[in-house]
Structure formats: C-alpha cells, structure tokens
C-alpha cells in the first residue's frame, strides 16, 4: 500500500529572465527513492538516478541545474517555461509518486510565490 | 556481461514496415538509452532515435520523425524500432546500442547489438 | 543539428607509426556544469558493429589499449593512435552527444602503408 505523499512548491511565478526552483518532498513513507524524474509536459527535463547521478536532458542543458537536493533550477526563464511540471518519484517497494507545480513566468516584476500544497 | 541480442535480417518491400527488436542482458534495463543507428551499404553511421525505458522518454532524428517509433518492453528488457513506408534507401544494417549520458560517467553509446540487415527490394 | 567533420577520410600508416584523426564540431560540445566534452569515439572492423574507444573526450573505455588517447576541447579533437598495430586497421568515427540529434562524423579509415 502506498503510503507517502509528495509535498512540493506548488503554484509558483517568476520574472522573465530570472531563475526558479522546482522541489519535491517526498514524506510518510519508508520506501527507498530509487530515481526522479523531472518533466515538463511530457518532455524529459532531468532524472536523478540514486545510483548513478543526474542526467540533464540534452535540450535543456544550458538552461537547467541539478538540485538543490533532488529538486531542479530553471534558469532564463522565458514565458514559454509556463506551466505544469512533475517530479516524478520511483520508489521501491511503493511504486510511482507524482507532484505537480504550475510555474507562471510573468513579464514585470510581480512574481509572487504561491502556496505550498501535498498531492496524495 | 552487458549483452544487447537483435533479431534477424528481414528482406521487405518498398511501402511496408519493419520491426527490429534488441533484448537486453546484463544491467538494469530502465536505467540506460537505447539508441538506434543505421548503416547504408559502405556508408556512414547515422543516429535514429532513442528511448530511455525508466519513463519511456524517446527522442527521434527529425530525418525520421514521422517513419519511426521507438519503444520499450520493461517486462522482457527488449526495446523495438519500427520504421515504415520503407525504400529502397533504407536498406541498411540497424544496429541497437546502450546510452549512458549520465553527468557524471557520460560513457556515450558503450555496448552494440550485433545488428540487424534490412533489405528493402521489390 | 551539430555537424561533425572528419580528417582525413583516409589515413595509410607504417606498423609502429603515429596516426592521427581529426574531428571538428560546428558548435561547441562542452557542457559548462561539469566541464566535459560529449564526445566520443568508435572502432569499427568489417563485419563487425562499432566499438567505443574514448568517452568526453581522452576517457578510454575498459579494456581499450593505451597506445589510443584522445584530446581537445570546445569544437576540435583528435584521436591519436600511438604506434599503430595491424589489429588498430579499421574505420574511426568521432560522435557528439551534447544534443540531439547525435550525429557522427563521416568517418576515417585507417590502414597500413
């Protein structure tokens, strides 16, 4: 039975031009992490394996930092960065967590953070 | 010992499909790409596509974007390549290969299939 | 798409002589967060599939005799074979991986003078 749940940042803007960060946490679950996967809409961003390290997706390797931790920098953002991406957790012996954040990239320099929110 | 075993030559004709399979031994199989390359008769070496099993992530040439599907079979460790509308210019031997692209072994295309001769003549 | 260009396209080479292949990359292939070079580069014999040499640049792969090393950086490389051997006689492909599509150069055919 699948126990954990993923806490993540939720919805978030930024300015254009500017950096975010995309974190995950994954509690109330002893199940080791075995990988996570990073995707915007269906398109690799990045996989942190646990045994072999980070891989950056060649279309995005001068726009994308690993970490901190297993969480993920987007740097020079533009406002094509907004919308849904997923942190995808694979987990052994649970299975498969999903935690999704809204990223708006907004062209003043309003940018709020959202609230943090857990998907089950 | 890393081992990727391909499936036999196929002769087709021009308009028709072909499947190839690579079965893969040796190492955890939705860790790494797998790569698909071609080589025409005395030619060069030519990039397809490749999928990553561990999210069925794929990536296609866009020479061959709308012919080609790439898949994978965690359950038996095979990935496929399926290329359609053949031609004549498509006889070449495809040949599968495991992709690490880590950040940190970054080891590129490191174990080869044997290959797999497809002829494509009316 | 990256283009990767070969030189020679064929090399003669006495037993026990240097040989030297050149690779140049339209665009440079170093990824600054780790400061490697994606490229790599492939043995093939008739008959037989390609074989990895070196890896980022001047890695030899397991198993690969060190009379093979490769250097450069940014958009031009090199792969020298030391003292070359009659088992070294081959086709040598330089390949990037920095982006996709990963494209291969057009190859080096390396025999005995």
């Known amino acids: 039975m699948m126990t954990g749940t993923i806490e993540t940042t939720g919805n978030i803007s930024a300015e254009k031009g500017g950096s975010i960060i995309l974190q995950c946490h994954l509690s109330s679950t002893t199940a080791q992490v075995t990988q996570v996967n990073w995707e915007q809409q269906d398109q690799l961003l990045a996989i942190c394996n646990a045994d072999l390290g980070w891989h950056i997706s060649p279309s995005f390797k001068d726009r994308v930092a690993p970490g901190p931790g297993l969480g993920l920098t987007l740097q020079s953002l533009t406002v094509n960065d907004t919308g849904e991406y997923f942190c995808i957790y694979h987990t052994y012996p649970d299975g498969t967590y999903t935690g999704r954040i809204f990223l708006e990239v907004l062209e003043s320099s309003v940018a709020e953070h959202g609230a943090r929110f857990q998907i089950p | 010992e890393v081992q990727l075993v391909q499936s036999g030559a196929e002769v087709k004709k021009p308009g028709s499909s072909v499947k190839v399979s690579c079965k893969a031994s040796?190492?955890?199989?939705?860790?790494?790409?797998i790569g698909w390359v071609r080589q025409a008769p005395g030619q060069g070496l030519e990039w397809i596509g490749d999928?990553?099993?561990?999210?069925?992530?794929?990536n296609y040439n866009e020479k061959f974007k709308d012919r080609v599907t790439i898949t994978a079979d965690k359950s038996t460790s095979t990935a496929y390549m399926e290329l359609s509308s053949l031609r004549s210019e498509d006889t070449a031997v495809y040949y599968c290969?495991?992709?690490?692209?880590?950040?940190?072994?970054?080891?590129?295309?490191?174990?080869w299939g044997q290959g797999t001769l497809v002829t494509v003549s009316s | 798409d990256i283009v990767m260009t070969q030189s020679p396209d064929s090399l003669a080479v006495s037993l026990g002589e240097r040989a030297t292949i050149n690779c140049k990359s339209s665009?440079?292939?170093?990824?600054?967060?780790?400061?490697?070079?994606?490229l790599a580069w492939y043995q093939q014999k008739p008959g037989q599939p390609p074989k990895l040499l070196i890896y980022?640049?001047?890695t030899r792969e397991s198993g690969v005799p060190d009379r093979f090393s490769g250097s450069g950086s940014g958009t031009d490389f090199t792969l020298t074979i030391s003292s070359l051997q009659a088992e070294d006689v081959a086709v040598y492909y330089c390949?990037?991986?920095?982006?996709?599509?990963?494209?291969f150069g057009g190859g080096t055919k390396v025999e005995i003078k």
């Open positions: 665009q440079s292939l170093l990824y600054s967060r780790n400061q490697m070079n994606y």
């Open positions: 999928i990553y099993p561990g999210g069925a992530y794929t």
């Open positions: 980022w640049t001047s």
């Open positions: 390949q990037q991986y920095y982006s996709y599509p990963y494209t």
């Open positions: 040796g190492y955890t199989f939705s860790n790494y790409w």
């Open positions: 290969a495991r992709g690490d692209y880590y950040d940190s072994s970054g080891r590129a295309m490191d174990y």
